[in-house]
């Protein structure tokens, strides 16, 4: 057949769906690869064709749209499963073509099993809530388009294995779950189960997300340099190892990039000739505040190195700070036999 623009296997869109639940999967061509939508393509006489490759097989085969109760169907640019089965797992391809044009993309679909507490290999989206910040809500995700607005589904919310009822600060409100005041104890996995009727059958949609309670913007401060500080003097003799830790606390800030760096005499360590190594470690608090430690190390320090200016810098979306380390050369202790004896007039 004629050449087809093949976008390959789009592994960025690893689609996971639960077994025995409806799934609607849009052809990724129109969302991520082509500059026109399905309606335009259809009006121009292009046809959307679906086929698939079963798990652990190489053979591409057409999708069977003649299954009982239309278990698999296509509607515009959407492939429907009502419901999925475990052996629907595989790579699916949607191809848009006419006699002169062809474009296709494949994507993996994984049908996963869940247990009675909604545990599964499903990758969960994370929703961050600010601690002690007033009312915040999460919404049951990815349920649009499954039923018309005239259908009123029932929605049940769970935290872990427990149905949410009479929780002191968490209130189910239909598709939304409201947190009156988010606390660390609200961390966990939340599941909404949406039940709706369709053509005399009842379907369930299960959606789980992870709630992570993070530091509030009310508590956010510019970076705080705990070390170096004015209380510690790094006093060394030439030839000794110089180790200076720079320890910086960063408040959690959504989408902030936290940076720590050293300068030596105003230059980045990479831009100077002395043999400096810098090791970084990072720890996170329960609310995702961050402590970064960068240890500046000079294995064998020279008297010249001990005269340099060592400054630790830190930057976040809240501001930039810097602190110089107090470095000095240790005055050698007097050698009694020579220096003190000389003081007594001995030669």
């Amino acid at each position: 057949s004629e050449r087809c623009d093949d976008w390959g296997l789009d592994t960025m869109r690893q689609i996971q769906v639960f077994e025995d639940e409806p799934a609607r999967i849009k052809c990724p061509l129109f969302e991520h690869f082509l500059k026109f939508n399905y309606s335009t393509a259809h009006s121009a006489g292009l046809t959307l064709i679906w086929y698939w490759t079963r798990q652990d097989r190489d053979l591409e085969e057409p999708i069977n749209f003649r299954l009982p109760e239309n278990r698999i169907s296509k509607e515009k640019d959407v492939l429907w499963f009502r419901p999925t089965l475990l052996n629907d797992t595989g790579n699916y391809t949607c191809m848009l073509r006419n006699t002169t044009y062809c474009s296709k993309v494949a994507f993996p679909l994984e049908v996963v099993q869940k247990d009675s507490c909604f545990n599964s290999p499903m990758k969960l989206p994370v929703h961050k809530l600010y601690i002690e910040y007033g009312i915040q809500r999460i919404t049951c995700p990815n349920v649009d388009g499954y039923f018309p607005s005239s259908v009123k589904p029932t929605i049940t919310w769970y935290m872990g294995c427990y149905k949410i009822q009479n929780f002191n600060n968490v209130i189910p409100e239909g598709m939304n779950l409201s947190f009156l005041i988010a606390l660390i104890s609200n961390n966990g996995n939340y599941t909404c189960v949406v039940t709706y009727p369709e053509n005399g059958r009842t379907f369930h949609l299960t959606r789980t997300l992870t709630v992570k309670v993070v530091g509030s913007p009310k508590n956010a401060v510019p970076p705080v340099i705990h070390s170096p500080n004015d209380h510690v003097v790094y006093e060394k003799e030439p030839g000794e190892e110089l180790l200076i830790p720079c320890t910086v606390y960063f408040s959690f800030l959504m989408d902030s990039r936290n940076e720590v760096w050293w300068t030596i005499d105003g230059k980045k360590p990479d831009d100077i000739t002395i043999d400096v190594t810098i090791n970084e470690s990072i720890s996170h608090s329960r609310t995702e505040d961050e402590t970064r430690t960068q240890i500046l190390s000079i294995k064998k320090v020279t008297s010249e190195d001990l005269k340099r200016s060592y400054v630790c810098h830190a930057r976040s979306a809240k501001g930039e700070v810097a602190k110089a380390a107090k470095v000095k050369q240790k005055v050698p202790a007097p050698r009694y036999t020579v220096e003190l004896a000389c003081g007594f007039g001995a030669t």
Partner: antibody, heavy 119, light 108 residues
Framework: QVQLVESGGGLVQPGGSLRLSCAAS?????????MCWVRQAPGKGLELVAC???????TWSASWAKGRFTISKTNSTTLYLQMNSLRAEDTAVYFC????????????WGQGTLVTVSS | DIQMTQSPSSLSASVGDRVTITCQAS??????LAWYQQKPGQAPKLLIY???TLASGVPSRFSGSGSGTDFTLTISSLQPEDFATYYC??????????FGQGTKVVIK
Amino acid sequence: QVQLVESGGGLVQPGGSLRLSCAASGFDFSSNYYMCWVRQAPGKGLELVACIYTNSGNTWSASWAKGRFTISKTNSTTLYLQMNSLRAEDTAVYFCARDLNYPDTSNLWGQGTLVTVSS
Amino acid sequence: DIQMTQSPSSLSASVGDRVTITCQASQSIGYYLAWYQQKPGQAPKLLIYRASTLASGVPSRFSGSGSGTDFTLTISSLQPEDFATYYCQSYYNSDSDAFGQGTKVVIK
């Protein structure tokens, strides 16, 4: 009324076992509380023993407690500490406490139960 | 493991005195420090969390300050009911959950 009540303490011989209980009232474990056992030897300070998230069941134990002390919970409102191979130095008041992972308005302690390990 | 070092281990003071207790962490814990008061035969009572936030019902003569590794609990004017043992607690993350060894405040 929101409270914690410990029980199960008493006299036990070295090498023996004991199971402490902590009954929660006024709340249940369906919310993800961080429930801990903290001990205090006579005339000494507070020492964290083990903790559990009540919803997920994830646990944490002090390094010295691993292998001898096990924290667990029932589905609803009871926390346990199973203590095996007890030693004289385990003699202490054992407190049950809530939300030590972010002590704030929800922080709560029981009155404690005394465990004496002696022959 | 983190070490929390309180000083002094005990202090004697009179009613009306200003009292300061310090707590030093062996590694940076940001603002994640709580202070508790414990009286003989009783459970600890939360006084301050997040280094400086007063727990509900705690008198304003208690205050906390500090961040990183160095923290202070101050009682601005000691009252008869304040004679007790005070503990600091780190809760930055599960690797840093620990109590200080305590500071006993006794009547001079």
